[in-house]
């Protein structure tokens, strides 16, 4: 991963505009505050992806954390992101604000902990009391991340001087627990299945040597109990799991699981749920639209991509003019299918450098032994406009004719536009257009065909002037939607020799 | 009171496979685990393997290609698979019982000698 | 995997007199939720499987005479045996119960003169 600037650390102006890039050889994404902040994402054509983070009206509360990390992580080091902290020094925001939980710190061992008090300015000085206390106690302070120490348990508050004013944070608590609290985790193999499949579910708890596992399910309602199993995990001390598994899962075994722990010692109590669904059958769906006719740029590198939801996991195929696609070794197409949540998925046909022979019709089928789905759609293939052919003639009527010729794809507009003064036109003088309402005496005549073969439509058109009294620069413009193309040519008086 | 007895053949020849069975008793293996130690000749012990109250497996890393663990609760048995025997396999082998949370082995059983040789 | 190393290897002592052996883990086996040390030691006596004596560093099996005392934290552990009778003739070994997987030690050799 590479971030512009570096950092890691830097200092910005309030109400200043900052921009951030940060860019990978895998889709990258700049995280604040654990939130994806918007941002521009990009991909190159070397291959290299790109997110650039614009930070607009920048105030003491931008002050922070800001991290790249790659979008998804799967295939490569999990653990690779780039941290950046930004201060923005505000003389309007004393302390930055905490959560409530950031406020009450509970301890069950004695080790160093943080008291997260922050500033927007690295340069204030800023010391740690006891709530009740003047004193500054010799606590090292990191403008990052607070004071960090072994603290008794007592509340504190940190203090700094902002201009000529004494500014206070809110008040830190510090609890020191003697057992530790519960805290639990419950898992499902599944949280999907078809009925006659088994729902097992699985609640953790860590560091009670002691606990009593309650599950409530919707078959314990109807009084049909399922015994669970508790499993003493060997990896670490006090690493306890319950273990419910209910065979032949029926329709009304769907609905909520609740796993509840306590200990007795102290009574303390923790509980977390998990909803399984119970189907009668697999399903295959498609999730959002996709268009009937879709665009790649000639020579570009385009993704079609189709986002479902199967259970259980479907076999993708994809199809173009009713024949099998598969990745060619070539490089030239790319099909990946990605499992995102336990029952979305992402399918993506990529076409690399698309050819014009590459349009045509396309399907994506997705199905498995319950239900399939298939999308479709035709891909045309744009074609930036290119002047063939401008030509002047001089047919015995007397009129002189300018003759262009282009092609792209989609179809091209056409347009004509002229200039008398060859000096000073076209940088100071706009060129005039012309056509069959221009006060010019010309007319037009303009044909188009489609070339099934080239998949793009040629546009010939003939300029008729008629009469030419001075030189003149005559201008042919192609123009479509990914491009246009530009030629002149100056047309002389018949009775100018050339 | 609690129990565990080791059984197996004494004798196996090199590539063979060795399977041993531990029988407890005084105890649930739905409690608690069930571990395999062996003492080499020359006096030192080595963790095999174990399967824990639920019936999770463990395995030595640099033996695990070699290991089966399994267990039939309704007869109170613990069964150790290991493969493609070597001469180094040679020890003393002896199953645990593994005291839930806390994870030390709180009785052992009389072990069983197994000797590899051609 | 946690590595435990033993000394020494093997002590003569007169009945009576009081042996320490030490235990070093390559990780501090001290656990953090209730700041106990997962450290066992065993005794094996000839001929015998071996037998538990301590766990959890200090806390003695139940029959386990008081003269054997488990002490330590973090990485380094002793085994003292305050007055060493006849019968403590045997091999000892620590063990990280910490969790998988279990390394044991490579023993010390009590030899009484």
């Known amino acids: 991963l590479v971030v512009t600037p570096p950092g890691p650390e830097l200092v910005l102006n309030v109400s200043s505009t900052f921009v951030l890039t940060c860019s990978g050889s895998a889709p990258v994404v700049w995280e604040r505050m654990s939130q994806e902040p918007p941002q521009e994402m990009a991909k190159a054509q070397d291959g290299t992806f790109s997110s650039v983070l614009t930070l607009t009206n920048l105030t003491g509360l931008d002050t922070g954390e800001y991290f790249c990390t790659h979008n998804d992580s799967r295939g490569l080091e999990t653990d690779e992101r780039k941290r950046l902290y930004i201060f923005v020094p505000d003389p309007t925001v004393g302390f930055l604000p905490n959560d409530a939980e950031e406020l009450f710190i509970f301890l069950t061992e004695i080790t160093e902990i943080t008291i997260p008090c922050r500033v927007t300015d690295p340069q204030l000085v800023v010391t740690l009391h006891e709530k009740k206390g003047d004193v500054a106690l010799p606590v090292p302070y990191d403008h990052q991340r607070g004071f960090s120490g072994i603290f008794e348990d007592r509340s504190y508050i940190c203090k700094t001087t902002i201009g000529d004013r004494e500014v206070d944070s809110d008040a830190y608590y510090v609890y020191r627990l003697q057992v530790s609290s519960i805290n639990v985790s419950v898992n499902a193999v599944q949280t999907v299945v078809r009925q006659g499949e088994n729902i097992t579910l699985m609640c953790i708890v860590i560091g009670n040597e002691v606990v009593n596992f309650e599950w409530t399910y919707p078959r314990k309602e109807s009084g049909r109990l399922v015994e669970p199993v508790t499993d003493f995990l060997l990896d670490m001390p006090y690493h306890i799991r319950s273990i419910l598994h209910i065979p032949s899962a029926e329709l009304e075994d769907s609905g909520t699981y609740t796993c509840n722990v306590t200990e007795s010692v102290n009574d303390h109590q923790d509980e977390k749920a998990i909803n399984i669904t119970v189907v009668e059958s697999g399903y295959v769906r498609l999730l959002g639209e996709v268009g009937t006719l879709q665009f790649a740029e000639l020579h570009r590198s385009r993704t079609l991509q189709v986002v479902f939801e199967a259970y259980p996991p479907p076999t993708v195929l994809w199809f173009k003019d009713n024949r099998t696609l598969g990745d060619s070794s070539a490089g030239e197409i790319a099909l990946s299918t990605r499992n995102v949540s336990e029952t979305r998925y992402v399918s993506e046909l990529t076409l690399v450098r698309v050819k014009v022979a590459e349009a045509g019709h396309y399907t994506m089928r997705a199905f498995h032994e319950d239900a399939e789905v298939q999308l479709s759609f035709q891909l045309q293939i744009n074609v930036p406009v290119r002047v063939l052919e401008l030509s002047e003639s001089h047919p015995d009527s007397g009129e002189q004719t300018v003759r262009c010729r282009g092609r792209g794809m989609p179809q091209p507009n056409i347009i004509w536009s002229a200039c008398r003064d060859l000096k000073r036109c076209p940088r100071e003088l706009p060129p005039t257009l012309l056509g069959n309402s221009s006060e010019e005496e010309s007319q037009l005549e303009t044909n188009v065909t489609y070339w099934e073969e080239e998949q793009e439509f040629e546009v010939v058109s003939t300029l008729r002037l008629q009469h030419v009294d001075r030189p003149l620069s005559v201008r042919c413009t192609l123009r479509n939607a990914v491009g246009q193309d530009t030629q002149e040519v100056i047309v002389v008086p018949h009775s100018l020799p050339f | 009171q609690v129990q565990l007895k080791e059984s197996g053949p004494g004798l196996m020849q090199p590539s063979q496979t060795l399977s041993l069975t531990c029988t407890v008793s005084?105890?649930?293996?739905?409690?608690?685990?069930v571990s395999w130690v062996r003492q080499f000749p020359g006096k030192g012990l080595e963790w095999i393997a174990a399967?824990?109250?639920?019936?999770?497996?463990y395995y030595n890393s640099a033996l695990k290609s070699r290991l089966s663990i399994s267990r039939d609760t309704s007869r109170s048995q613990v069964f150790l698979k290991m493969n493609s025997l070597l001469t180094e396999d040679t020890a003393f082998y002896f199953c645990?019982?593994?005291?839930?949370?806390?994870?030390?082995?709180?009785?052992w059983g009389p072990g069983v000698m197994v000797t590899v040789s051609s | 995997d946690i590595v435990m190393t033993q000394t020494p290897s093997s002590q003569a002592v007169s009945a009576g007199e009081k042996v320490t052996m030490s235990c070093k883990s390559s990780?501090?086996?001290?656990?953090?939720?209730?700041?106990?040390?997962?450290l066992a030691w065993y005794q094996q006596k000839p001929g015998q499987s071996p037998k538990l004596l301590i766990y959890?560093?200090?806390t003695r099996e139940s029959g386990v005479p008081d003269r054997f005392i488990g002490s330590g934290s973090g990485t380094d552990f002793t085994l003292t045996i305050s007055s060493v009778q006849a019968e403590d003739l045997a091999d000892y070994y620590c063990?990280?119960?910490?969790?998988?997987?279990?390394?044991f030690g490579s023993g010390t050799k009590l030899e009484i003169k």
């Open positions: 005084g105890f649930s293996l739905t409690n608690y685990g």
């Open positions: 990780q501090s086996l001290l656990y953090g939720g209730d700041q106990k040390n997962f």
């Open positions: 645990t019982r593994v005291y839930y949370g806390s994870n030390y082995f709180d009785y």
């Open positions: 063990q990280q119960h910490y969790g998988y997987p279990f390394t």
């Open positions: 399967i824990s109250s639920g019936g999770s497996t």
């Open positions: 959890l560093a200090s």
